[in-house]
Interface confidence: medium
Amino acid sequence: GPAKSPYQLVLQHSRLRGRQHGPNVCAVQKVIGTNRKYFTNCKQWYQRKICGKSTVISYECCPGYEKVPGEKGCPAALPLSNLYETLGVVGSTTTQLYTDRTEKLRPEMEGPGSFTIFAPSNEAWASLPAEVLDSLVSNVNIELLNALRYHMVGRRVLTDELKHGMTLTSMYQNSNIQIHHYPNGIVTVNCARLLKADHHATNGVVHLIDKVISTITNNIQQIIEIEDTFETLRAAVAASGLNTMLEGNGQYTLLAPTNEAFEKIPSETLNRILGDPEALRDLLNNHILKSAMCAEAIVAGLSVETLEGTTLEVGCSGDMLTINGKAIISNKDILATNGVIHYIDELLIPDSAKTLFELAAESDVSTAIDLFRQAGLGNHLSGSERLTLLAPLNSVFKDGTPPIDAHTRNLLRNHIIKDQLASKYLYHGQTLETLGGKKLRVFVYRNSLCIENSCIAAHDKRGRYGTLFTMDRVLTPPMGTVMDVLKGDNRFSMLVAAIQSAGLTETLNREGVYTVFAPTNEAFRALPPRERSRLLGDAKELANILKYHIGDEILVSGGIGALVRLKSLQGDKLEVSLKNNVVSVNKEPVAEPDIMATNGVVHVITNVLQPPANRPQERGDELADSALEIFKQASAFSRASQRSVRLAPVYQKLLERMKH
């Protein structure tokens, strides 16, 4: 058969939950401390909560059935009677009473024809303000007749015909009634919830609803123009040109900020947005939903997309509607011909209307932002340049922040990219130019996206002119080739000599993408004499070992994930892993990762790696001539740097011998 409507699916679930109590029994959830009852869907059944409030399960006859004394469940179908009597069956006795008062209406309800009545419950009538009720029953009951006729449709309409966003023609001046049928099974009529649906009568059908409904005369724009509390919103809508949409056809939800909502925003923020047509349009579109959403439809958290594109979490807490967890809706379900308005007393500013400063203020990067400000870069972060800010997380600075000197200023300038980027469009090998004039490289890994040594730690926040990338560490732009990096650091004097001896200098100086695991002088010194002699005694062997320390792509620590097998220039693979924020290569910890170079990255290690296919062979402790040159250079370099190279006695003697 045809697909069941959401209402029918929920009813079916309630029937399923109630069947152990007999035929045609439905499980109903009642919110504790209220008279609010709901047929139950799967999620609510297990959570036992509606709008965050606890519920109790009771078991009632499903619509259209009744109990039979001495029998289990609700085996009997309700006897069919006319509409007037059916009002009594569904418990809408107040509607019966008012029908009697009109004199004209009861004969219609008892006579021939086919009608639908959306009958307000007794509680709905009782909750009407006294003055409203008085006005209905005065004027020779004509107002009452009109009101009741507005609750009626001149044909039989069952819930399976009640489609989301449809309008029905009422029997009062052919005025429209708005129907919404939500995915959670809730059906509303002018935002009043259907409590008991599809009660058949001989001449129609009765649906019990939880409110007295009234005619809708104004569109959203007209309501904004009428209400004093929307004075600022009115001006903003006019300035943005959105009034055409808000008075046109369609079904929207306007989360309408009151004057008070605008007053909560600092003047400078408000002036900036109001003076910027694009930001203003984004701000207003962030308060408009693409369809009408009545308060009664919200029984739990629901993600909705605004016209601006931001996702809002609409929820409820008891009787209060919430947006992003905050109870900021002060007046709900103001109906318009083209949708529904909820008054809100806090402005929902989308990222797209914010400066980089404002985006950063809502992220975990406040320490970095203070550094940018102190470094005199504030104007870039609040101006109209198209920029991307690479802002390290606060946790990066847990041990303190650097002093603001020329070096820090320059470093910070290299955290600002001269373009407004989106991470989803970045690609591996892309270069990005910074305000400091540096070119930064993009590395795309399986589970991370990195810019130089720093990886993106949170979703982008795209502002009016700037985008915020939250980064997992301070970014260090490359200062030279791998060879420059190694030569510029005293710890690597022996490695530099070894590279030169092995003829790899040119490789590590030219353009390329290398990951170098760089053993320190201590690593070389820690080698047993046998290993050292093997390593240094043969330039070809030395080149082989050194190539095993060089990966053929750039792998920064943020790109490792759990384990990466990195192919070395020697041919064998290096096992690079990350555990508890410590990088290891072949299970040996890296002392200092991520020293960036223009043609690669250097990771400092304190041991020399041995290729698996190249196990040490027994050798004498004689030192080959080719290797002596290495140590002569390394030793001289070390002395020049006021570091002594402590060599094993046999080498010391050989070096002494060389001097004579």
């Epitope: 007053e263 600092p266 400078e268 003076g275 500013i349 404002e358 203020a361 104007n379 609040s382």
Partner: antibody, heavy 120, light 113 residues
Framework: QVQLVQSGAEVKKPGSSVKVSCKAS????????MYWVRQAPGQGLEWVGT????????YYAQKVQGRFTITRDSSTSTLYLELSSLRSEDTAVYYC?????????????WGQGTTVTVSS | DIVMTQSPLSLPVTPGEPASMSCRSS????????????LAWYLQKPGQSPQLLIY???TRESGVPDRFSGSGSGTDFTLKISRVEAEDVGVYYC?????????FGQGTKLEIK
């Protein structure tokens, strides 16, 4: 370094007008919000008005709205405050002030002040 | 308008001793979206223009000695001087930049005993 050099003292009669100037140097003038703050003799500080970085927006204290006008000339990096329909209660030292940056509104750098005396 | 109220109006202090002054606003200066307090402190030394000491309620302006510290949130703020020096005399003003019109407190006059 940042400098805000204001024009000299003025003595004026009630009902008359005067234009006070403030010459900025040591920073990109067009990148900053600028402010005027005044201090009546023996009294505290009172914000008079603000002009945006591009000179498009100006905001005034209610007391001076309609009588005072703030303008700026980016070509000469000069800020102006024109005081008209002067009253005796406008007697004060008027300070030219630079904001922190393009939007944020605290008063980072102050001029030396211009004394305006309104007396019959 | 947001009214700023400072206390005490006069604060005699012995050099080397700490000093503390208060500033209260008639409405909250904490902007929930960025959790920043839109409050600044200034010092006006005798015969001089005012100078900025603190912004965002607690961020010290560069060049301001670290004996000055700002604290507080919402409507109640405090400026503390850990050890007063002779050069600290003058009038201290708090100011809100949360909403136009920007307003100052009436000032606290710090003098040496």
């Amino acid at each position: 370094q940042v400098q805000l050099v204001q024009s000299g003292a003025e003595v004026k009669k009630p009902g008359s007008s005067v234009k006070v100037s403030c010459k900025a140097s040591g920073f990109t003038f067009s990148d900053y919000y600028m402010y005027w703050v005044r201090q009546a003799p023996g009294q505290g500080l009172e914000w008079v008005g603000t002009i945006s970085d591009g000179g498009i927006y100006a905001y005034y204290a209610q007391k001076v709205q309609g009588r005072f006008t703030i303008t700026r000339d980016s070509s000469t990096s000069t800020l102006y405050l024109e005081l008209s329909s002067l009253r005796s209660e406008d007697t004060a030292v008027y300070y030219c002030v630079r904001g922190w940056d393009r939007y944020d509104s605290w008063f980072a750098c102050w001029g030396q002040g211009t004394t305006v005396t309104v007396s019959s | 308008d947001i009214v700023m109220t400072q206390s005490p109006l006069s604060l005699p202090v012995t050099p080397g001793e700490p000093a503390s002054m208060s500033c209260r606003s008639s409405q909250s200066l904490l902007y929930s979206s960025n959790q920043k307090n839109y409050l600044a402190w200034y010092l006006q030394k005798p015969g001089q223009s005012p100078q900025l000491l603190i912004y965002w309620g607690s961020t010290r302006e560069s060049g301001v000695p670290d004996r000055f510290s700002g604290s507080g949130s919402g409507t109640d703020f405090t400026l503390k001087i850990s050890r007063v020096e002779a050069e600290d005399v003058g009038v201290y003003y708090c100011q809100q930049y949360y909403r136009y019109p920007y307003t100052f407190g009436q000032g606290t006059k710090l003098e040496i005993k």
